[in-house]
Interface confidence: medium
């Protein structure tokens, strides 16, 4: 959480960002929010990012204004037009690229004053592990795979009846470069599992952890995943 | 080998009550959960029910909730399934079922006991 | 509840010829779906277990695949014993275990 103050004159408002991630290939959201105004047509809101001449995006008078505009951003970005008033100046990104990482600054003017703010944008791949039983292993073993992740993962699997043990020795796991040649598919086998237990299997890089969990008994099979962002917030 | 014998069907009215047996042999029944299954005439098969190897844990398909209880005794390797409150519905030929391991699909099976719900 | 359907509900093949199964989940089971055969006052019998593995003791020219929503059991060479009726069955979340309505395989 990033919180920036400006000064024109005697005014000064506050602008907010959040940390924030972009999974690339899909489309992402740079958050930033400031003390609203009602007159539109007296916000400007303009997106930069360093190292790059030219805007990533303005908005300015009710609409966007793309003559600034960077070439890698052209066609890209979009604002939040109908929340503007209310203090959103968060932009979209589609299609998230590899070298959309860097830091941004959202800059703000309103007829109460002016400010800014910077977030961190990192980007990557994460995505959710799905658990199956293995049935091409010759024991009773666990699958987790999960289908786009970069930079390269680490994966962990945990037991809720073994807390704390090791399972590097009994688990392989490997990383298939998918077609796009950037991100990863991330499979994991763990072997000699047993009934009457719940396992996690853990991927985690700089940017998301994932957690996939089966619960495995004679009586029934509940799975669950879940994904987090890291940094962000 | 392993072996799943039913027993206990039989023709029974609307309302009434039955208990179907299950004597399992040939592996150790203590450590697997069983399952029954049923078949209505021409029709295809549905899940009843499934008790955990201790007995600590059941599940009933919507279709019986409350109506039927699955408990086993270990001691004599036996099965059973109470069904209680009958209906016309419940006429089937019920199968028990061995499940186990990681592997929730049905290698075992008994050769079923017919169930007739009629006035 | 996971839905299970099965196509076609009758299929009426020569002896000899090939048959083709199909089965699909009303959401993704991975691979976790098993193959059942029964005959007329019969118990099922296991075929294939985790979508493409045939059971112990079953012949060759059975054999599965398909994953995610979409599977077929296929009989390459249709025996005259092979005349029966096939269940599809997911296990990959349960409580309910759930079969599909079944294909009756008759003699064209």
């Known amino acids: 959480l990033i919180i920036g103050f400006g000064i024109s004159g005697k005014h000064f408002i506050t602008v907010t960002t959040f940390t924030s991630a972009g999974n690339i290939g899909e489309d992402g959201t740079l958050s930033c929010t400031f003390e609203p105004d009602i007159k539109l047509n007296g916000i400007v809101i303009q997106w930069l990012k360093e190292g790059i001449k030219g805007l990533v995006h303005e908005f300015k008078e009710g609409k966007d204004d793309l003559s600034q505009q960077h070439e890698m951003f052209r066609g890209r970005t979009a604002v939040f037009a109908d929340q503007v008033v209310v203090g959103n100046a968060s932009l979209r990104l589609k299609n998230v690229q590899l070298t959309d990482a860097g830091t941004y600054t959202c800059y703000i003017r309103t007829s109460k004053g002016k400010g800014n703010a910077n977030l961190e944008y990192k980007t990557g791949a994460f995505s959710m592990p799905e658990i199956n039983v293995d049935y091409n292993a010759s024991s009773e073993s666990l699958r987790c795979e999960a289908p786009r992740w970069f930079p390269q993962p680490t994966v962990a699997w945990a037991s809720q009846v073994d807390q704390g043990a090791n399972f590097s020795e009994v688990s392989n796991t490997s990383f298939e470069l998918n077609s796009e040649n950037v991100t990863m598919k991330v499979v994991s086998v763990l072997y000699n599992v047993t009934i009457n237990n719940t396992y996690s299997c853990m991927i985690e890089n700089d940017i998301a952890k994932a957690t996939g969990d089966i619960k495995v008994t004679d009586s029934e099979v509940k799975r669950r995943s879940q994904l987090q962002l890291l940094n962000s917030g | 080998q392993v072996q799943l014998v039913e027993s206990g069907g039989g023709v029974v009215q609307p309302g009434r009550s039955l208990r179907l047996s299950c004597a399992a042999s040939g592996f150790t029944f203590r450590s697997f959960g069983m399952h029954w299954v049923r078949q209505a005439p021409g029709k295809g098969l549905e899940w009843v029910a499934v008790?955990?190897?201790?007995?600590?844990?059941?599940y009933y398909a919507d279709s019986v909730k409350g109506r039927f209880i699955i408990s086993r005794d270990n001691s004599k390797d036996t099965l059973y399934l109470q069904m209680n409150s009958l209906r016309a519905g419940d006429t089937a030929v019920y199968y028990c079922?061995?499940?186990?391991?990681?592997?929730?699909?049905?290698?075992?099976w008994g050769q079923g006991t017919l169930v007739t719900v009629s006035s | 509840e996971i839905v299970m359907t099965q196509s076609p509900a009758t299929l009426s093949v020569s002896p000899g010829e090939r048959a083709t199964l199909s089965c699909r989940a009303s959401?993704?089971?991975?691979?976790?779906l098993g193959w059942y055969q029964q005959k007329p006052g019969q118990a099922p019998r296991l075929l294939i277990y985790?979508?493409?593995t045939r059971a112990t003791g079953i012949p060759a020219r059975f054999s599965g695949s398909g994953s995610g929503t979409e599977f077929t059991l296929t009989i390459s060479s249709l025996q005259s014993e092979d005349f029966a009726v096939y269940y599809c069955q997911q296990y990959n979340s349960w409580p309910p275990l759930t079969f599909g309505g079944g294909t009756k395989v008759e003699i064209k």
């Open positions: 008790i955990s190897y201790d007995g600590s844990n059941e």
């Open positions: 985790g979508a493409s």
């Open positions: 079922a061995k499940g186990g391991g990681l592997r929730w699909y049905f290698a075992y």
């Open positions: 959401q993704s089971i991975s691979s976790n």
